[in-house]
């Protein structure tokens, strides 16, 4: 005898993404990353807030820092002083641009439990850090750097020219901290904290930004940024080394320029020291196909800093720009001259070079028709990066072993095997002289961070397995994905399909194409996400695909370089092929396609709604590019050369989305951009507009007041209900 | 340089207490951070609680709320008081010094150590 309906069936208790639930980020996952302080220890904020040390060879844990201390002054972020005396805690965070922002410091001594009176820090400052042995502070105020010596003595001011959008000392300014660093800070600490080195960054000539932010004033403010778009003038950038201990002595000496890049415009593209009297940086020619490493020694006689030329090494691309997306950085082995570093070989795919007196003799230490992409740590027998190597997925990452202590060397991979199905993509955190070591797994299946023994690479535990997600996950009806591959033409698209839970091949459904694009940008990678795609997929019934075309990455040069000097051809071309086939394959929808993009994408999904190829019913364009004159300097130059005549003007002319204005027509199109944009200029979509309204072309957009590139916050949930209504009408869905 | 003489160790049932002293030769005690290392047969010597010179002191979490760690310079002396002990706290008692912060939990970090004293908590 059997009921005659099943009410609890899985079936029935399962249920679909809802868009709240992605606004919400009520599928969101949690990482693990060990904050480590020396070769078995790591620091971790607990969720109660408390700043707790553990010994992982005693499994012992210790509250060092109360979540009383930190709520005592806001804080919402620490640093321990190497020599465990002191912390800072950070409060009154203010973003400025991607990485920086502004912040109030309070330091905290361990010894009294006290926060340290006298001589406080001024705010708001721009960046502080501690020696990386001692207690000594670095800190940028007012775009000039200060040394103490001790947290409570009275500040030492290194720099004195430094003024706002016109001089920035240990900071970088716009362009170096989105396009080239990409970091907050341009000051360098030497291993045992003796030097300092610093870069200067003069923009006293480059042309500005200038933007309205409205808030809520009787009258707008003006931003302005200093930014150079193509072809404009650059930043000016100095380095100077200053020996902290003695500061005021011979005060900051300026390491010297290569002469070969010296000779025209040029990058600084950053600095590595290598012991407390050796340091090496890395300079680019404003055209980015050579870079040069140059090692530098200290005189002690002469208290300068000398950089031979036989000390020089040169990196220099015949097919396109300098590295992947940036120049690698050298990894020093133990001798303190020669290093590891990733470049292109012979066959043009990235992977990891041994150099010890010039790059000609280099030694190549991976090779195959795959990539390394990171090397994480080099001891005295082992070198650990990341490939995509295994089982030829490029969108995949495992972490590796290479014993460099022995010959041959051996290579094994650490992650491979581990959690087979759950984790393909993996990156690596590693403790003094790499003991130990974290591995934070971010897909396919949910992230999971766990502790590994640097020497046997056993599983010491889980640091994190978001078994709350899982759980959460149990009733949900997720997509479908699939990661495959098409070969056209010689070229293969790697593509990720991301399919409704009850797909059937025998049914039609609408496509949306979700598109970046951007040279050395990979979208098709093996990670976990539960995103806006995956509700439109489980709730809205469609297939959602993602390409990564001519211009990606991490597929060697061939297809990497494939774009240079062409931007916004073959990345347009591959996503319509991609489209064509999969209307081959039988269950797509073709009069119910779209394709959607932000930054780069939006350029990208624009040229193809532009494309008069018929295919695309609708699409949306999020703060997109428009053309590549409006965009930055060294970002742009990299892959399109100079806006002039004698070189790539006519491409910058002919990639436009303006050109093709009246290729709208026949599209649904959606434009949207934030009106504080920063990175991509509201301009580039003001001149969008500008032109199809000249060209009597029907469109729809929306603007955020106020928003950056990122449009954060609230306007994240309009954007996304506005986009969602915008595709269900262009693909007749039922609200 | 500073001698480190422990004592105070001994047999006592679960839920017993015990409170052990370390006392310390030399005038600059004060500027001493002072620890309480344990070590169980074949397991590795973990600190148990430390207090700084300037009197901040911090525990494992292991005995937190269980243990105290006190010192009284005029005497040169620190103190560990036990209490609510467990049969899983039965090791050699180590007293530990070093200069600077307290905040260190690798023994190697301590240069300074007394002979130890016995602790066994018994069931």
């Known amino acids: 005898l059997r009921p005659s309906r099943v009410h609890n069936s899985e079936e029935n208790t399962m249920r679909a993404l809802t868009l709240k639930d992605i606004l919400n980020g009520t599928f969101s996952y949690k990482t693990f990353f060990p904050n480590w302080i020396s070769g078995q220890e790591y620091l971790h904020q607990s969720a109660d807030n408390n700043i707790v040390l553990y010994n992982i060879e005693t499994g012992q844990s210790y509250t060092i820092l109360s979540n009383r201390t930190m709520k005592s002054v806001n804080a919402s972020n620490y640093g321990l002083s190497p020599d465990r005396q002191f912390v800072y805690l950070e409060s009154d965070y203010s973003k400025l641009w991607r990485y920086s922002y502004t912040a109030t410091y309070y330091i905290y001594d361990l010894s009294n439990g006290e926060f340290v009176r006298g001589n406080e820090l001024p705010r708001p400052i721009q960046y502080l850090c501690w020696s990386p042995v001692g207690s000594k502070l670095a800190y940028v105020y007012q775009n000039n750097i200060y040394l103490k010596q001790r947290p409570g003595d009275p500040p030492f001011q290194i720099t004195f020219n430094g003024r706002e959008n016109k001089i920035f000392n240990g900071i970088p300014d716009w362009v170096y901290e989105e396009e080239m660093l990409p970091t907050k800070y341009a000051l360098w600490w030497s291993p045992n904290g003796k030097f300092l080195a610093y870069a200067e960054f003069n923009d006293k000539d480059i042309p500005v930004i200038a933007y309205s932010y409205y808030g809520d004033e009787q009258y707008p403010r003006t931003i302005n940024i200093p930014y150079p778009k193509a072809g404009a003038k650059n930043p000016v950038v100095r380095i100077f080394i200053i020996d902290t201990t003695y500061p005021a002595y011979v005060g900051p000496q300026e390491v010297p320029v290569p002469a070969m890049i010296a000779s025209s415009d040029y990058y600084f593209s950053w600095l590595t020291w290598v012991t407390d009297e050796r340091v090496c940086l890395q300079w680019l020619k404003r055209v980015q196909n050579v870079s040069v490493l140059s090692i530098c020694d200290f005189r002690e006689d002469w208290q300068t800093w000398d950089c031979p030329k036989t000390q020089e090494h040169i990196e220099e691309s015949r097919t396109g720009w300098a590295g992947g997306f940036f120049v690698s950085r050298p990894v020093f082995s133990y001798d303190a001259i020669s290093y590891y570093k990733i470049f292109s070989d012979k066959d043009g795919y990235k992977h990891i070079h041994y150099i010890k007196d010039t790059v000609e003799n280099a030694i190549q230490i991976t090779s195959g028709k795959w990539e390394a992409i990171n090397i994480f740590r080099v001891t005295q027998d082992s070198l650990f990066y990341s490939s995509n190597e295994f089982e030829e997925y490029p969108g995949r990452r495992n972490i590796y072993r290479i014993s460099i202590g022995s010959y041959p060397p051996s290579k094994k991979c650490v992650t491979c095997h581990l959690r087979k199905e759950r984790c393909q993509y993996y990156t690596a955190s590693f403790s003094d002289y790499a003991k130990y070591y974290a591995l934070v797994c971010y897909g396919p299946g949910i992230p999971i961070s766990t502790l590994h023994d640097g020497r046997t690479d056993q599983e010491i535990k889980i640091l994190e397995e978001n078994k709350e997600l899982e759980n959460a996950l149990k009733n949900i009806q997720l997509p479908k994905e699939e990661i495959k591959k098409l070969e056209v033409d010689e070229i293969t698209l790697w593509y990720k399909m991301i399919l409704p839970p009850q797909f059937d091949r025998s049914k039609k459904y609408p496509l949306l194409i979700q598109v970046y694009g951007g040279p050395c940008s990979q979208s098709v990678r093996s990670v976990f996400a539960v995103n806006w795609i995956s509700y439109l997929a489980s709730k809205e019934g469609m297939v959602i695909a993602l390409v990564d075309g001519r211009g990606t990455a991490f597929q060697g040069d061939k297809l990497l370089y494939a774009v240079y000097r062409k931007l916004g051809v073959y990345e347009v071309e591959d996503q319509i092929t991609a489209v064509r086939k999969f209307i081959e394959m039988g269950f797509i929808d073709e009069k119910r396609i779209a394709i959607w993009g932000w930054s780069y994408g939006g350029y990208v999904s624009s040229l193809a709604l532009a494309s008069g190829t018929g295919l695309f019913k609708c699409g949306i364009a999020v703060a997109p590019v428009s053309s590549w004159e409006y965009y930055a300097s060294v970002y742009t130059e990299r892959f399109m050369g100079l806006p002039t005549k004698d070189d790539n003007l006519e491409h910058y002319k002919n990639s436009t989305v303006m050109a093709r204005a009246e290729y709208f027509r026949n599209v649904d199109y959606l434009l949207i951009h934030g009106t504080a944009d920063d990175n991509v200029h509201f301009q580039n979509s003001a001149q969008i507009a500008k032109a199809l309204v000249n060209a009597q072309v029907d469109f729809q957009a929306m603007w955020y007041s106020d928003q950056n590139h990122g449009l954060s916050g609230l306007s994240t949930n309009h954007l996304y209900t506005h986009m969602t209504h915008f595709l269900k009408q262009c693909f007749s869905l039922s609200d | 340089q500073v001698q480190l003489q422990e004592s105070g160790g001994g047999l006592v049932e679960a839920e017993g207490s015990l409170r052990l002293s370390c006392a310390a030769s030399?005038?600059?005690?004060?500027?001493?951070?002072m620890g309480w290392f344990r070590q169980a047969p074949g397991k590795s010597r973990e600190l148990v609680a430390a207090?700084?010179?300037?009197?901040?002191?911090y525990y494992a979490d292991s005995v937190k709320g269980r243990f105290t760690i006190s010192r009284d310079n005029a005497r040169n002396t620190v103190y560990l008081q036990t209490n609510s002990l467990k049969p899983e706290d039965t090791a050699v008692y180590y007293c530990?010094?070093?200069?600077?912060?307290?905040?260190?939990?690798?023994?190697?970090?301590?240069?300074?150590w007394g002979q130890g004293t016995q602790v066994t908590v018994s069931s």
């Open positions: 530990a010094a070093r200069t600077g912060s307290a905040y260190y939990t690798n023994r190697i970090d301590w240069p300074y």
């Open positions: 030399g005038r600059t005690f004060g500027s001493y951070a």
């Open positions: 207090i700084s010179s300037g009197g901040t002191t």
